[in-house]
């Protein structure tokens, strides 16, 4: 389980020609909201699945009113993260989509009207617990800057947030802030603890009990919206609802390992490899004999009677480093099969195996695909206890009978087209309707009457979802 | 692995009627695209001749393609096909077949076949 | 008939140059963004960079970049490789379900 965060930095006019002055139409002053979406993936055959691992719909954006003569600016913004908690495992691959809408606010019959600004979809690799990746696109005459990430929840670990952690009470050498893991892996896992009181919105910790801001944030806290800033070279002025840009300096920036110590970035965090002769976090222990223990893990201490003379550590099996102070990650090698959840138990590896399997790796399969039909071209896949299909695109159901195209029911109105876009149907309407399914004939004068409620667009946009 | 690839003649005579198939793998005409029929005179740009969309078999041609392009499916031989009327050497060129899912674009392209109208 | 309309028609630049094409419809293009880019290398189909205007294909590398709406587009490669010597076509799709190709941007490696 974990959490994909977003932040949108920045939305306003993209360069270039036809560059929109304002968000709002001429019926008055409108706010944005942004809406996310997170598919599995990375397949173009994806085309029929919702946001399966989950979406998020940001609060409204201040009211923004044009003002004709001043410059196009960025748009003011909803304050805060999007956040989309997801239950199982962090795919690693998915379609990240983002849709800018707009709420306009003049005298709308039935309330306010909702219509579709602008839409972003992009197709990423991202490993849950690494640092925030950074990204400026562009959806027709709009420029959008955002940055996002994926993190573990507590108990869960690692880079699918797959692997079970929870806090022990026994003393550990692990680091400031670092708690050992339990049942099986005895290692030193999670992110460090905040200061107190450290805005969740608007502020991080790279190391336990600090508390840094996000550009356009400051205070103790973070919770004090800076006047000023400078956006890290983003185009227009920063505002306090903008959120601006997200934590500038890593954690290596300046290099923290002292003594020639080299260092490498961990998720939240950071980690120092020392020259033999020191230790410590920042490699900041020095003159240590092997009087004084300097080996982890049960590492055998060699040489370095005096202060003067350098000790070598020969590590146990499953560690590694000057020190012996760094587990080998032999999971990361993925040596269980068919899906099997890998547990590093330091003298040996186990393969706790899904239902359907069973070996020292998983690597014997306990279904039989013999005798079952999958229809449609679809394969049989053994495996979860019974066999089950992988369907061609197009088809679903157990044995691949039924059809699964999200354009089957015919969506799209008055002889629109549907398409089984990856990021989901797509209308594209004939000429003379509009609206989310084509559903709304476009009067003479090129307007329509929209429902009250998103998603609603000009004449003659395209319908996404 | 999802493929398109063009077959027929590599030589037609002038006034006859050219045919080409598209053979598809990889996916289902049960879902709904727009399969096209693209192609290049050498040393020229790309020209769009057609498009059948699989959702109701519906098909549109560019305007000087009405009259002499059919474009029809046969889904039981994951396959579609371009007819040219009346070729002459001006219709020498590379044909491509394309697939759209959205968004106007064709994200899916055969190699080509090139094609020689000539007696 | 649309006409979409591509400039410069050849161009010649250096390793590292910024180099920008640009493609003007007669009409607007569908949604004001069904506008697509492709490079074609001789003897190989087309292949997609830009969608949607600016939506960049998976795999494209990052230097291509695309923008605009209605009808007038640009295709910008920010500091030209080696490899992106090819033609470059832009292409729209229209209200009635109509497609139209640019007449395509020869980029040559000085």
């Known amino acids: 389980a974990g959490v994909f965060e977003l932040q949108i930095h920045s939305f306003g006019p993209g360069p270039g020609p036809g560059a929109p002055r304002s968000p709002c139409s001429a019926r008055g002053p409108c706010r944005l909201f942004f809406r996310v979406c997170l598919k599995p993936g990375l397949s173009e055959e994806a085309a029929e699945s919702p946001c399966a691992l989950g979406a998020a719909l940001s609060a409204r954006g201040p009211v923004y009113t044009e003002q004709p003569e001043a410059p196009a600016p960025d748009l003011p913004l909803p304050n805060g993260l999007l956040q989309v908690p997801f239950r199982d495992a962090w795919p690693g691959t998915f379609s990240l989509i983002i849709e800018t809408w707009r709420e306009e606010l003049g005298d709308q019959i039935g309330g306010p009207a909702w219509s579709l600004l602008a839409r972003v979809t992009r197709r990423r690799r991202l490993a849950a617990g690494g640092p925030w990746a950074r990204d400026i696109q562009r959806a027709g005459a709009w420029e959008l800057r955002f940055s996002y990430r994926a993190r573990c929840e507590l108990p869960a670990v690692g880079t699918a947030c797959t692997r079970l952690c929870r806090p022990r009470s026994a003393p550990s050498r692990c680091g400031p802030g670092l708690r050992p893991c339990a049942p099986l892996e005895d290692e030193c896992e999670a992110p460090p603890v905040c200061r107190a009181g450290c805005s969740l919105e608007h502020g991080f910790c790279e190391q336990p009990g600090e508390c840094r801001c996000l550009e356009g944030w400051t205070g103790p806290l973070c919770t004090v919206p800076a006047s000023t800033s400078s956006c890290l070279g983003l185009r227009g002025p920063s505002s306090a609802t903008t959120g601006c840009l997200v934590p500038g300096p890593g954690p290596c920036d300046g290099n923290p390992c002292a003594n020639g110590g080299s260092c490498s970035e961990t998720p939240g965090s950071f980690e120092c490899t020392c020259p033999r002769g020191f230790y410590g976090l920042r490699c900041e222990v020095s003159g240590v004999t092997c009087a004084d223990g300097p080996c982890f893990n049960g590492g055998l201490c060699v040489g370095g009677a005096d202060p003067d003379s350098a000790y070598i550590c020969h590590c146990p099996p499953g560690f590694q480093g000057s020190n012996c102070e760094k587990r080998v990650d032999r999971c990361s090698l993925q040596p269980c099969r068919n899906g099997g959840l890998c547990l590093d138990l330091g003298h040996a590896l186990r393969c706790r195996c899904r239902a359907g399997f069973a070996g020292p790796r998983c690597e014997h399969n306990l279904d039989d695909c013999a005798g079952r039909a999958c229809a449609n071209g679809g394969t049989c896949v053994e495996g979860g206890g019974a066999h089950r299909c992988s369907c061609a695109l197009g088809f679903g159901g157990r044995d691949c009978r039924e059809r699964a195209d999200p354009c089957a029911a015919r969506p799209c109105a008055h002889g629109g087209r549907c398409y089984a876009h990856f990021s989901g149907l797509v209308c594209a309407c004939a000429p003379g309707y509009m609206g989310s399914r084509c559903e709304f004939p476009v009067h003479p004068d090129g307007v329509s009457a929209l429902p009250a409620a998103p998603p609603g667009l000009r004449p003659g946009d395209p319908q996404r979802h | 692995q999802v493929t398109l690839r063009e077959s027929g003649p590599a030589l037609v005579k002038p006034t006859q009627t050219l045919t080409l198939t598209c053979t598809f793998s990889?996916?289902?005409?049960?879902?709904?695209?727009?399969m096209g029929w693209v192609r290049q005179a050498p040393g020229q740009g790309l020209e769009w001749m057609g498009t059948?969309?699989?959702?109701?078999?519906?098909?549109d041609y560019a305007s000087w393609a009405k009259g002499r392009v059919t474009i029809s499916v046969d889904t039981s031989k994951n396959q579609f096909s371009l007819k040219l009327s009346s070729v002459t050497a001006a219709d020498t060129a590379v044909y491509y077949c394309?697939?759209?899912?959205?968004?106007?674009?064709?994200?899916?392209w055969g190699q080509g076949t090139l094609v020689t109208v000539s007696s | 008939d649309i006409q979409l309309t591509q400039s410069p028609s050849f161009l010649s630049a250096s390793v590292g140059d910024r180099v920008t094409i640009t493609c003007q419809s007669t009409?607007?293009?569908?949604?004001?963004?069904?506008l697509s880019w492709y490079q074609q290398k001789p003897g190989q189909p087309p292949k997609l960079l830009i969608y949607?205007?600016?939506n960049l294909e998976i795999g494209v590398p990052s230097r291509f970049s695309g923008s605009g709406s209605g009808t007038d587009f640009t295709l910008t490669i920010n500091s030209l490789e080696a490899e992106d010597a090819a033609t470059y076509y832009c292409?729209?799709?229209?209200?009635?379900?109509?497609?139209?190709f640019g007449g395509g941007t020869k980029v040559e490696i000085k």
């Open positions: 394309a697939r759209h899912t959205g968004y106007g674009y064709f994200g899916l």
């Open positions: 990889g996916f289902s005409l049960s879902s709904s695209y727009d």
């Open positions: 059948i969309y699989t959702g109701d078999y519906s098909t």
């Open positions: 009409e607007s293009v569908y949604g004001s963004d069904w």
């Open positions: 949607q205007a600016s």
């Open positions: 292409q729209g799709y229209y209200s009635g379900y109509i497609y139209a």
